[in-house]
Amino acid sequence: MNGRVDYLVTEEEINLTRGPSGLGFNIVGGTDQQYVSNDSGIYVSRIKENGAAALDGRLQEGDKILSVNGQDLKNLLHQDAVDLFRNAGYAVSLRVQHRLQVQNGPIGHRGEGDPSG
């Protein structure tokens, strides 16, 4: 029997300092480029090696970025989101949502970390 896959969603505030080559990551998403079904949010698609984000270590590929310097990223065109990051200044505050996949045991078996029972 297959285990069921659950997700643990957490939010975090990440403060990055723009490095010589910038913030060091790529994004996908936006109202004109939905990456997740029925969600026009902005997601991290790539963390560049030795960039500011990689050196900080907290931002992960697959994270959803909720806001930049307090500005909500909802309902933005893809390029408008890109421009927001590019114009965000030297010190950049990101509100991000991490989505951690949790593999539970097969039905009938209480896996580690399963609070039920």
Partner: nanobody, 127 residues
Framework: QVQLVESGGGLVQAGGSLRLSCAAS????????MGWFRQAPGKEREFVSA????????YYGDSVKGRFTISRDNAKNTVYLQMDSLKPEDTAVYYC?????????????????????WGQGTQVTVS
């Protein structure tokens, strides 16, 4: 991550044309910015052309401007490089490259570091 396979290379006479194709596997192709680079024997890798995820923006190296045209078909997961008025100095191995998503930093399509996925290359020889 997509995998990239180039095709369409070959031997052509000066003044002739070729169309290179780069086929991508995977369902995320439409999120990729795509580029073409080339490398001639004993020379450094050279930027040829690039195209944005939507196809709205295109970029060309100085040596191919006005002769080469990049395009993409997101329904077919393919990017094309139409090469016209070919010259012997266009002889090289041509590589397709992809960048997943848009950089939030200043974009330089000619910088190989922008790209995270590369094809194996296809030989173009102009005699």
């Amino acid at each position: 991550q997509v995998q990239l396979v180039e095709s369409g290379g070959g031997l052509v006479q000066a003044g002739g044309s070729l169309r290179l194709s780069c086929a991508a596997s995977g369902r995320t192709f439409r999120y990729y910015s795509m580029g073409w680079f080339r490398q001639a024997p004993g020379k450094e890798r050279e930027f040829v052309s690039a195209i944005s995820w939507s196809g709205d923006s295109t970029y060309y190296g100085d040596s191919v401007k006005g002769r080469f045209t990049i395009s993409r078909d997101n329904a077919k997961n393919t990017v094309y490089l139409q090469m016209d008025s070919l010259k012997p100095e266009d002889t090289a191995v041509y590589y397709c490259a992809g960048a997943f998503g848009s950089t939030v930093d200043n974009y330089d399509p000619s910088d190989p570091r922008e790209y995270d996925t590369w094809g194996q290359g296809t030989q173009v020889t102009v005699s």
